[in-house]
């Protein structure tokens, strides 16, 4: 008894506040952001509920359990049915996807009067009748049964229940069992698909709420997206089907990807790999542009299908050979350009002294805001520079081969420490905004991964360019291949590295003054960090704007509560 209908043998006034809370929470079902997890799978869901005398004072808990779970399955293609059993099985609500009918069905469920024996097989019979009828109509939608019972089934009743559950399975259903209180787990494991398909609730009916999440996780089979969602007409492709629960099949070898083409022909393909959250499937070759293939998944070799709103469309793609030729031409041009660039280096080698750097090298940024080039530094304290007895540290900067002829010949003292810069260029740290927050990154684009790699390649090329450009002869330079010439500056070199400040007479213009290094922009920051978990793709049906109402509007007087 414990129903809203007579309404008594249930849980009493202490339930009223809890019921209100449950209804508020349940009203949020279907919105992943604030309503907890939800299921977007399109299949037929049957609740088979024990309403025998043993659940007399527990019907409220059963009702709230079903109500909360029902609101988590939010696909417009999901259909639901409520079946109750005691001495006989009754279909309280026939299979429907109509949210208003489901709301009414839940209202009726609340009015159930527990009583009678535990003839669970009667419940499975009512489910099988509907599955058989739906299959005969040609729908062949995947079926999931969630059966709830609270007691041990006597020998004959267990035999009948197992037999009827097997019939439902033969029709393509996946069977889960929820056992509450005095259930026999071994029995339920045989009625359900396996031990993994049994949800034990040992702490009594009040603990039913605690398994909603795990039931949802295990029973939900959903297709969320396909990648790519557009394929080339006439080409063979592989499709990654993203979703959940693909390994919930009794046998993963029986999982199939199904493509319903233009709402007529259905092509089934065996996936290359089956993971819980994705399938890798060969896509059918669709000859014409504009063809649409609705994606479905079968967990039982095509006996029945989980539907989705995910569509794969075909588009016209240019011939690959044109692209190949274009790439080849581009490659040849690049080869010629490189040859043109590097050929003079083979023929004329000009060795000259690098003009000395300014006496005071500061670590600060250049006018363009970029740090200066780093050179290796030697702690010259050991040579006796800077102060009495050479105690104060003095750093001398080294050019590539020494900044002067003498410098080039200079050897390090045995105990001189050389610090090599860690990288040729230091890129400025990304500037922090106030309160240490990094500037928000731009949204990740489809080309972000490629762009990141190209940026890295570009940096390497620029480094190479800068190194080569220093050595590259200018138009006035002469020389033959493998004909080395040393050009010497007239200006005497002073040690240590302070030529810049020698002003007695201006030095003659050098044969070649290396151009300043090309300004080095730091590579653009990666387009975005790892993107946030995407909300379900736009191909999915949006969850209902407002979740289906949980109840009819309250009557003028509060309905009497079941007694406890």
């Amino acid at each position: 008894m414990a129903t809203a209908e007579r309404r008594a043998l249930g849980i009493g006034f202490q339930w009223l506040s809890l019921a209100t809370l449950v209804l508020i929470c349940a009203g949020q079902g279907g919105r992943r952001e604030d309503g907890g997890p939800a299921c977007y799978g399109g299949f037929d869901l049957y609740f088979i509920l024990d309403k025998s005398g043993s659940v007399l004072h527990h019907w409220n808990e059963i009702y709230y359990f079903v109500e909360q779970l029902a609101h988590k399955f939010i696909s417009p293609q999901l259909r639901m049915s409520f079946i109750v059993f005691s001495t006989r099985g009754t279909t309280l609500m026939k299979l429907t996807e109509d949210r208003e009918q489901i709301r009414q069905g839940l209202e009726e469920l609340q009015k159930v009067l527990p009583g009678g024996d535990t003839y669970m097989h009667e419940g499975f019979e009512r489910a099988s009748e509907q599955i058989y009828y739906e299959n005969r109509q040609g729908y062949r939608t995947a079926s999931v049964i969630i059966a709830l019972t609270d007691g041990e089934l006597h020998e004959d009743l267990f035999f009948y229940s197992e037999r009827e559950a097997n019939r439902s399975r033969d029709l393509g259903a996946i069977v889960y069992c929820v056992g509450v209180k005095d259930f026999n787990e071994t029995q339920l494991a045989r009625i359900a698909d396996s031990k993994d398909h049994v949800f034990p609730v040992n702490d009594g009916f009040q603990a039913l709420q605690g398994i909603i999440h795990s039931i949802l996780k295990k029973s939900c089979i959903e297709i969320l997206a396909a990648e790519p969602s557009t394929i080339c007409a006439g080409e063979s492709f592989q499709v990654v089907v993203r979703g959940n629960g693909f390994r919930h099949a009794r046998n993963v070898d029986r999982v199939l990807c199904s493509f319903k083409i233009n709402d007529s022909v259905t092509l089934n393909e065996k996936p290359f790999s089956v993971e819980d959250t994705y399938l890798l499937c060969p896509a059918p070759i669709l000859k014409e542009v504009g063809m649409k293939a609705a994606l479905q998944v079968s967990m039982n070799d095509g006996l029945s299908f989980i539907s989705s709103s995910v569509i794969i469309t075909t588009t016209h793609c240019s011939d690959g050979s044109i692209l190949a030729i274009a790439l080849l031409i581009l490659f040849l041009l690049l080869a010629l350009a490189l040859l043109w660039w590097f050929w003079p280096l083979c023929c004329t080698v000009i060795i000259k002294e690098v003009p000395p750097p300014p006496a005071e090298e500061s670590e600060e940024e250049d006018d363009d805001g970029l740090p200066k080039k780093k050179w290796p530094t030697v702690d010259a304290s050991y040579y006796g520079g800077r102060g009495v007895g050479g105690i104060k540290r003095m750093e001398v900067r080294w050019g590539e081969k020494g900044s002067t002829e003498e410098g080039a010949k200079l050897e390090k003292a045995k105990n001189a420490r050389v610090k090599m810069p860690e990288q040729e260029y230091e890129f400025p740290e990304p500037r922090n905004l106030n309160n240490n927050m990094r500037r928000p990154s731009s949204p990740r684009k489809w080309y972000s991964p490629i762009k990141g790699k190209l940026d890295a390649l570009w940096v390497l090329l620029r480094k190479g360019y800068d190194r080569v450009s220093v050595m590259r002869p200018q138009p006035g330079d002469t020389g033959r291949c493998i004909n080395f010439t040393r050009v010497k500056n007239n200006q005497p070199a002073k040690y240590p590295l302070n030529n810049a400040y020698h002003t007695s007479s201006p030095p003659p213009a050098p044969i070649y003054t290396p151009p300043p290094p090309a300004p080095h922009c730091p590579p653009p920051p990666p387009s975005a960090p790892t993107p946030p978990i995407p909300s379900p793709p736009s191909t999915l049906p949006p969850p209902p704007q407002a979740p289906p109402p949980n109840r009819a509007p309250p009557p003028s007087r509060p309905p009497p509560r079941p007694s406890v």
């Epitope: 007579r6 008594a8 009493g12 004072h57 009015k111 007694s563």
Partner: antibody, heavy 116, light 112 residues
Framework: QVKLEESGAELVRPGVSVKISCKGS????????MHWVKQSHAKSLEWIGV???????ATYNQKFKGKATMTVDSSSTAYMELARLTSEDSAIYYC??????????WGQGTLVTVSA | DIVMTQTPPSVPVTPGESVSISCRSS???????????LYWFLQRPGQSPQLLIY???NLASGVPDRFSGSGSGTAFTLRISRVEAEDVGVYYC?????????FGSGTKLEIK
Amino acid sequence: QVKLEESGAELVRPGVSVKISCKGSGYTFTDYAMHWVKQSHAKSLEWIGVISTYFGDATYNQKFKGKATMTVDSSSTAYMELARLTSEDSAIYYCAREDYVPFAYWGQGTLVTVSA
Amino acid sequence: DIVMTQTPPSVPVTPGESVSISCRSSKSLLHSNGNTYLYWFLQRPGQSPQLLIYRMSNLASGVPDRFSGSGSGTAFTLRISRVEAEDVGVYYCMQHLEYPFTFGSGTKLEIK
């Protein structure tokens, strides 16, 4: 106010059937199930069963299975038919409403006398 | 079935006195939800039974607070303080824990 009105007394011969009624008023009939209780001199009070006025399904005391059949109709009336009457079936039969507090409302009772 | 046993079968009492009626069940009536499903009824002569106490200790609507119920899982007591003449009749206990619901045999309260 809530009222349960039972049909009048019945004098019947052994072996026949009798159908007694209980009409609910002052509330939404289908919101509350209906119990039937037998009171005889020998056995004091005995619970016969309860019927869902919404769905029409009933739960019986095993002892009364085959003897009593409970039904409801759209006129806010619950019925109980007693079959193959014997002198042991002579008693007062009450209907009582299920509720948050069950058995808070009772009909006035119907006396059934089985006599040759 | 759960068997309900009432004692004594009959109790004579003087108006203004207090009286206690006992009821025992063959099985604990304490449910896992915390409620004890024991009910007390009074049937006055020529009338239908009237609910006095529900779920062991809760007073039904319109019942004077001279009536009170107490007990454990299997032993229950209905206490009437300051008995009045209108309290005469047969008192029944009933278990509402599981089907079939069962009644005690009744205790007849008489005025001395």
